[in-house]
Amino acid sequence: ALDTNYCFRNLEENCCVRPLYIDFRQDLGWKWVHEPKGYYANFCSGPCPYLRSADTTHSTVLGLYNTLNPEASASPCCVPQDLEPLTILYYVGRTPKVEQLSNMVVKSCKCS
Amino acid sequence: ALDTNYCFRNLEENCCVRPLYIDFRQDLGWKWVHEPKGYYANFCSGPCPYLRSADTTHSTVLGLYNTLNPEASASPCCVPQDLEPLTILYYVGRTPKVEQLSNMVVKSCKCS
């Protein structure tokens, strides 16, 4: 699986999850998030050669098409597969609220 | 929606579904598919600016991060959203078989 366990331990050029730390204030301008100050959102990148963690029949077909027609601009793309939530603290007026934001952390990638 | 109805009628630079005809023999080397000879598989391409058909909270965050940090390599990617099956005819020995291959035709795209 192209997950953090594999990708963070290997120098992988092809599609894999990469570490990306995002600071809510500095990187997004989100002053409303009080805790945490930032988090590892991570991201997916790298080429998708034929059959590499293909998401659907279409991505398999497109990967093969791209292999046999290397000049073509059509190829699968490395995108998030498994995502996890992030717990944040924000305020409504002067009342603190703890809430879970879904799909905030990329744990693995796929070729789609 | 970034679907064939919209994308095929507009000159859209950003993420959209694009027409792509694939000939089974010539483009894939698949001699086993007798009918159809080829089909419009289509593909997704184009930049994913902030908030464009964002798939998850993560792609929204990443789009904003990319807008505010344009030198960053992390950005959402334009990939298939809705896919449709394709019915094909092939032979097992001299026996014709009609089968539906799932997720073969891209009908719309998203930024993931």
Epitope: E35, P36, Y39 | -
Partner: nanobody, 118 residues
Framework: EVQLVESGGGLVQPGGSLRLSCAAS????????ASWYRQAPGKERELVAT????????HYADSVKGRFAISRDNAKNTVFLQMDSLKSEDTAVYYC???????????WGQGTQVTVSS
């Protein structure tokens, strides 16, 4: 088995103090947001105090600011709530909550009754 066990509740006079404890077991407590909530009869459960790992600032509901103090001991997998200058309106069932910062996992304690009355 995952467990959050609260203790330290009871009956106290107005102006008095109590110290609530919440012992966590079965998970890595240091990865979790630790919070205290309370629910008074006929009212919604409200957040009283919370602290994010590893060293996030404590945050408090307006009604308890300056009187209550949350602290955690990650080595002992425990979170505390020191409650001073207690008022009758602090009467409620107090619940300990642990929520993973990144990923799934939300756990609740069974609750401990705090009654402030003369």
């Amino acid at each position: 088995e995952v467990q959050l066990v609260e203790s330290g509740g009871g009956l106290v006079q107005p102006g008095g103090s109590l110290r609530l404890s919440c012992a966590a077991s079965g998970f890595t407590f240091s990865y979790y947001v630790a919070s205290w909530y309370r629910q008074a009869p006929g009212k919604e459960r409200e957040l009283v105090a919370t602290t994010f790992p590893p060293d996030g600032s404590p945050h408090y509901a307006d009604s308890v600011k300056g009187r209550f103090a949350i602290s955690r001991d990650n080595a002992k997998n425990t979170v505390f709530l020191q409650m001073d200058s207690l008022k009758s309106e602090d009467t409620a069932v107090y619940y300990c909550n642990a929520r993973r910062v990144e990923g799934h996992g939300i756990y609740w304690g069974q609750g401990t009754q705090v009654t402030v009355s003369s």
